[in-house]
């Protein structure tokens, strides 16, 4: 059967937890597994014995988004009897070649998705922006957490507006999901949002929402 | 219970494309994959392909690569399927289904037939 | 792509009999197999996951086994609602795979 190849180019694809370890190359006459380490630092088996070069791991990782995981990709000999005792893989009594994928830590890697804003409210002249708190994978007793509630006052939107007809932008942050700015009567705004991890180094930033215009709003409401 | 509404049946000219679309709940839609299969008339499923909304990631059977993309609008927790130069045997009821915790499908959708006919 | 070989494509059985699917993957697939039924113009319904794993609300009546490349799904005594095509499934590594199916019908 040959000696597997080793698994290269490791890496983990990551968005609001939703978490995915990829690898190469496809394999030919054996298979991979996965593993990954828990807080006790036991190895636990994912996607045993798979021919897929990718692993959802989400379920794992959002068991605790403050841990920095340790995962590693094993190459095992398709023909050869495996025994998988849960936290060990024993190929006649050796371990098959494996690779190690960098350490994720969720709270720090993972990238933030495109946020939405989610309505305008006006009050006379002061006009309400809302950020839709968008739910994660992350659970507290049984129930979804919210970013807001994952990241807490670490998490803030960079608001970017202008009049609809005017080129000026300006620029606000944020640390909560809402935003309030003075308006003329009578005048479209339109907004751009970016959602931002202030204790973040790199990776700090979400990518952009779609530009949203009070007058869309408007119609979109059928007003 | 997750409800995965398909868009209406479809007639059309072979040559022609089709797009078909699969509405599911708001909350966690982006997070979870979406996959197609179809079954022809008093044939078996067949898997053509799957998203994950919120990664962006597709991927699709060997069949179909080239001539079915699948994409989906996070915004409106809808996923798209579509499938270009269609033929007579592309007839079949194509379905989209959530794949659970794993890579087994929990939740289907209602069915949408697509009949390719001159 | 991974092979499904179900057998029997088809069976006569009555009400009360104890009825036995078998699925053959055609390389080790571990336990990642899921059983489905599907009824005449109605999308399929999964039955079991992980090749043993009772899906919730599906009755105790049902229930599969297997590991590696060899798989079953048994129903102990079945009903009038019963009557229907089932399907194997791997979800060991993509493509996704289905066996062709195996149609229950009344004796």
């Known amino acids: 059967a040959g000696i597997p190849e080793k698994a290269f180019n490791l890496t983990w694809i990551s968005t609001d937890f939703k978490t995915i370890l990829e690898w190469q190359p496809k394999p030919t006459n054996y298979t991979y597994t996965v593993q990954i380490s828990d807080r006790s630092r036991n190895w636990k088996n994912k996607c045993f014995s798979t021919t897929d070069t990718e692993c959802d791991l989400t379920d794992e990782i959002v068991k605790d988004v403050t841990w920095a995981y340790e995962a590693k990709v094993l190459s095992v000999p398709r023909r050869n009897s495996v025994h998988g005792d849960g936290d060990q893989l024993v190929i006649h009594g050796e371990e098959p070649p494996f690779t190690n994928a960098p350490k994720f830590l969720p709270y720090r890697d993972t990238n933030l998705g495109q946020p939405v804003i989610q309505q305008f409210e006006q009050d006379g002249r002061k006009l309400n922006v809302v950020v839709k708190d968008s739910l994660t994978l992350v659970r507290k007793n049984g129930t979804f957490l919210t970013l807001r509630q994952v990241f807490g006052k670490d998490l803030g939107y960079i608001i970017t507006y202008r009049k609809g007809s005017s080129t000026g932008k300006k620029t606000n942050i944020t640390n909560t999901n809402e935003f309030s700015i003075d308006v003329e009567e009578g005048v479209s705004y339109c907004f751009f949002v970016q959602a931002m991890i202030f204790s973040r180094k790199t990776n700090q930033n979400s990518p952009g929402s779609s530009t949203v215009c009070t007058e869309q709003w408007k119609s979109f409401l059928g007003e | 219970q997750v409800q995965l509404v398909q868009s209406g049946a479809e007639v059309k000219k072979p040559g022609s494309s089709v797009k078909v679309s699969c509405k599911a709940p708001?909350?966690?839609?982006?997070?979870?994959?979406i996959s197609w299969v179809r079954q022809a008339p008093g044939q078996g499923l067949e898997w053509m392909g799957r998203?994950?909304?919120?990664?962006?990631?597709?991927n699709y059977a060997q069949k179909f690569q080239g001539r079915v993309t699948i994409t989906a609008d996070k915004s409106t927790s809808t996923a798209y399927m579509e499938l270009s130069s269609l033929r007579s045997e592309d007839t079949a009821v194509y379905y989209c289904?959530?794949?659970?915790?794993?890579?087994?499908?929990?939740?289907w959708g209602q069915g949408t037939l697509v009949t390719v006919s001159s | 792509a991974i092979q499904l070989t179900q057998s029997p494509s088809s069976l006569s059985a009555s009400v009360g009999d104890r009825v036995t699917i078998t699925c053959r993957a055609s390389?080790?697939?571990?336990?990642?197999l899921a059983w489905y039924q599907q009824k005449p113009g109605k999308a399929p319904k999964l039955l079991i996951y992980?090749?043993?794993i009772l899906e919730s609300g599906v009755p105790s009546r049902f229930s599969g086994s297997g590991s590696g490349t060899d798989f079953t799904l048994t129903i102990s005594s079945l009903q009038p609602e019963d009557f229907a095509t089932y399907y194997c499934?791997?979800?060991?590594?993509?493509?996704?795979?289905f066996g062709g199916g195996t149609k229950v019908e009344i004796k």
């Open positions: 708001r909350g966690t839609f982006s997070y979870y994959t």
């Open positions: 499934q791997q979800f060991n590594s993509y493509p996704l795979t």
């Open positions: 992980d090749a043993s």
């Open positions: 289904a959530r794949e659970g915790d794993r890579r087994y499908f929990d939740y």
């Open positions: 390389q080790d697939i571990s336990s990642a």
């Open positions: 998203i994950i909304p919120i990664l962006g990631v597709a």
